[in-house]
Interface confidence: medium
């Protein structure tokens, strides 16, 4: 009769370990229309063989509590359910299952889930994708104001997302060591939604130039979560009939050095 020789398994199934590591703090942000790579790292106790593994990416939208498939890869085939979605097979060999999405739109924000199968094991991780749009800002004078010595200045921010934005007005007189926030004669209009889901807003400052010192610097400051530092636009009151006839378009970030020199 035959003796069956059982080979000793060096690694038992209990020793196999599969983990998925997502972006720290579980949140990633990208700008509207940019390309984003959503991070997903596969950690496996053995060298990876991509022909025997599967990757599926899902998105749960912020508005509908429903998951949709974005991309899948199984050994011999891959399919993008969202145009342009891609996982690099070259990088997958070294455990990088990150999903690349070109031209991200606002509605693509939500929870992304990376599901990895290395038979018989399965692991998954989730990350929130935030999509933001930076405001384009400009400062101009309302030419319709015809009262002598009175000027109405408009600071307009357009095509930003999300909706929350903070617009303030400040002034510097020549001798003041710091700037001062202006709260009087400031009206900030309602936030208006554009067709593409972004928002616009305008803030108005009314000035009586006969009561202001020539040389005073006025500044409109825009703060929004898409901006690393506030955007600021300055104008200088040069004479009683100060005018900014040409709209002063800008997307300038505020400049400035560190606190104290030396």
């Amino acid at each position: 009769h035959h003796h069956h020789h059982h080979e000793q398994k060096l690694i038992s199934e209990e020793d196999l370990d599969l983990k998925v590591e997502m972006m720290a703090r579980g949140i990633q942000a990208t700008r509207l229309n940019d390309s984003v790579t959503i991070s997903c790292k596969v950690i496996y106790s053995q060298p990876l063989n991509i022909t025997s593994m599967g990757i599926t990416w899902f998105r749960k939208s912020l508005t509908l509590d429903k998951e949709v498939k974005v991309f899948e890869f199984f050994g011999d085939h891959q399919k993008a359910f969202r145009p342009g979605a891609n996982v690099s097979l070259w990088r997958l060999k070294s455990g990088d299952a990150s999903l690349k999405l070109p031209g991200v739109q606002l509605e693509e924000a939500g929870e992304y889930r990376c599901e990895v199968v290395v038979t018989p094991l399965k692991a998954q991780g989730t990350v929130q994708l935030k999509v933001v749009a930076s405001p384009t800002s400009r400062l101009f004078q309302d030419q319709a104001v015809v009262k002598e010595n009175e000027g109405k200045y408009m600071c307009e921010s357009s095509r930003f997302y999300p909706k929350d934005i903070n617009i303030t007005w400040e002034k510097w007189t020549q001798k003041s060591p710091h700037h001062v926030v202006i709260s009087e004669n400031v009206i900030t209009g309602p936030t208006i939604k554009n067709m593409d889901g972004t928002f616009n807003i305008t803030s108005y400052l009314k000035l009586n130039s006969s009561q202001e010192d020539p040389g005073t610097v006025y500044r409109c400051v825009i703060r929004h979560e898409s901006l690393h530092t506030p955007v600021s636009i300055d104008f200088i009151l040069t004479a009683p009939q100060q005018s900014l006839s040409e709209p002063e378009k800008t997307d300038i970030f505020s400049s400035g050095g560190g606190g104290s020199a030396g």
Epitope: K175, P177, H178, S255, G256, G257, G259
Partner: antibody, heavy 117, light 107 residues
Framework: QVQLVQSGAEVKKPGASVKVSCKAS????????MNWMRQAPGQGLEWMGG????????DYNEKFKGRVTMTVDTSTSTVYMELSSLRSEDTAVYYC??????????WGQGTLVTVSS | DIQMTQSPSSLSASVGDRVTITCKAS??????VAWYQQKPGKAPKSLIY???NRYDGVPSRFSGSGSGTDFTLTISSLQPEDFTTYYC?????????FGAGTKLEIK
């Protein structure tokens, strides 16, 4: 990058005068107001006065009127602060300071003036 | 001249504590108040302008409030580098005047 570089430490005898310089770089020099502050050892801050950098306006603290003179050399972007009739209580670190931007105002590194007989 | 009365003159606290420094102006200064931090041997560094606005780069644990005559600087959770001296300053009118300072020490 705005920089304010001050002259070195000075030791003076009572009754003498001292002239501290502050050289500015990194911005349009003439369109700002420059202030001078001082700080006696272990004490708080005291405003001495200021000068508009085009050189046409000064504002002095009453406490120092008659003893302090602030001047500007626009060709070298340098501001000077001269304090006369020095006494021991004028021993202090003197700072020039300029209104800043979103990171705060700019200060020179300070000049220690010691008045001692 | 406008007097700025700062209190306390010194304060002992521990890392992680919330501390409040107050400054009282002898007359109405609106919101024209700034706060400075000064480390030994260094020039002061601006923290707050217009009573409650943080300069860029200043950690969010620093906050200012008040208007008129009463102002406060609050540090919500003290870090080791915060143990130094703080000054308030009014800039509504000349002469510019400062508080006498508050020295923050480790308990």
């Amino acid at each position: 990058q705005v920089q304010l570089v001050q002259s070195g430490a000075e030791v003076k005898k009572p009754g003498a005068s001292v002239k501290v310089s502050c050289k500015a770089s990194g911005y349009t020099f003439t369109s700002y107001w420059m202030n001078w502050m001082r700080q006696a050892p272990g004490q708080g801050l005291e405003w001495m006065g200021g000068i508009y950098l085009s050189g046409d306006s000064t504002d002095y603290n009453e406490k120092f009127k008659g003893r302090v003179t602030m001047t500007v050399d626009t060709s070298t972007s340098t501001v000077y602060m001269e304090l006369s009739s020095l006494r021991s209580e004028d021993t202090a670190v003197y700072y020039c300071t300029r209104r800043g931007d979103y990171f705060g105002d700019f200060w020179g590194q300070g000049t220690l003036v010691t008045v001692s007989s | 001249d406008i007097q700025m009365t700062q209190s306390p003159s010194s304060l002992s606290a521990s890392v992680g504590d919330r501390v409040t420094i107050t400054c009282k102006a002898s007359q109405n200064v609106g919101k024209y108040v700034a706060w400075y931090q000064q480390k030994p041997g260094k020039a002061p560094k601006s923290l707050i302008y217009s009573a409650s606005n943080r300069y860029d780069g200043v950690p969010s644990r620093f906050s200012g409030s008040g208007s008129g005559t009463d102002f406060t600087l609050t540090i919500s959770s003290l870090q080791p580098e915060d143990f130094t001296t703080y000054y308030c300053q009014q800039y509504i009118s000349y002469p510019l005047t400062f508080g006498a300072g508050t020295k923050l020490e480790i308990k």
